[in-house]
């Protein structure tokens, strides 16, 4: 029976992935019962991605490693709508690392997943970025401008946001 074998495979995948994420929250995509898209619990989902707010304070490099251990990366923000979704889950008195850095200090900003950096889809606070020695980007809240990006020193511990594609089982 096709449905039975599909269910067995799905349960096998869920069991296998438990070693990385003890619980997954899955939804059926569209009308086809064959396709389940999942995010780890308690990650949040938006479009085809899953997001996790890491409240541990770490450097940018350690934050990225923390994400990659979970099969994710520091967040790459592609649209205003995506940023609007993300900020719903952030605390105004905290700052969070993004997957955006300028390793050479030459203002060649690059996303961790090599998505091209597009000046037209950036949300820097006014006057930012403003320091060649500040080579990593955070998102934070400023009362005058709401949520936006700022460049900071990469070694200064911050909270962070991880993002990964939904898991399909």
């Amino acid at each position: 029976n096709f449905m039975y074998s599909k269910t067995v495979k799905r349960l096998s995948k869920l069991r296998e992935y438990q070693q990385y994420h003890p619980s997954l929250t899955c939804v059926m995509e569209g009308k086809d019962i064959e396709d389940w898209s999942c995010c780890p619990t308690p990650w949040t989902s938006f479009q085809s991605s899953c997001y996790f707010i890491s409240t541990g304070m770490q450097s940018w490099t350690k934050s990225q490693k923390n994400c990659s251990v979970m099969g994710a990366d520091l967040v790459v923000i592609n649209t205003r709508e995506e940023q609007d979704f993300i900020i719903q889950n952030l605390k105004r008195n905290s700052s969070y690392f993004l997957g955006l850095s300028d390793p050479g200090g030459r203002r060649h900003w690059q996303w961790v997943d090599q998505t091209p950096y597009n000046e037209n889809v950036t949300f820097w606070h006014s006057g930012e970025p403003n320091n060649l020695d500040e080579r990593c980007a955070i998102i934070n809240f400023r009362s005058s401008e709401e949520w936006g990006w700022n460049d900071i020193h990469c070694h200064v511990p911050q909270k962070s946001i991880c993002k990964m594609k939904k898991i399909y089982i």
């Epitope: 990385y20 490693k65 090599q114 594609k165 898991i167």
Partner: nanobody
Amino acid sequence: QVQLQESGGGSVQAGGSLRLSCAASGRTFSDYAMGWFRQAPGKEREFVATISKSGSSTDYADSAKGRFTISRDNAKKTVYLQINSLKTEDTAVYYCAARLSFDNTAFYTSAIRYSDWGQGTQVTVSS
């Protein structure tokens, strides 16, 4: 996480071949995309090749295309790098790296995206 151990390096004449191996232990090897990187003396670590967790997708640095082949045997928990027509500029320490992936076809060319690294194996090519 996975533990990685490279082997197969050594000294070889230009034009020769080597097959590097990277044996993994720990978590389920077939859940990890793998990559090879190298670091020559006085230079930054650079990407060489990468392979998806299923082995269905690969990618290479321009300098590796045509001479390098990455492959994996999930049953043996090992990833390989076959290097042919070795050049003196291939002299470097070669590292393998692993990264958890939930996508059968995803591969990763950036070192920062890998969570686990081996200790490296030295490759020296003389003319």
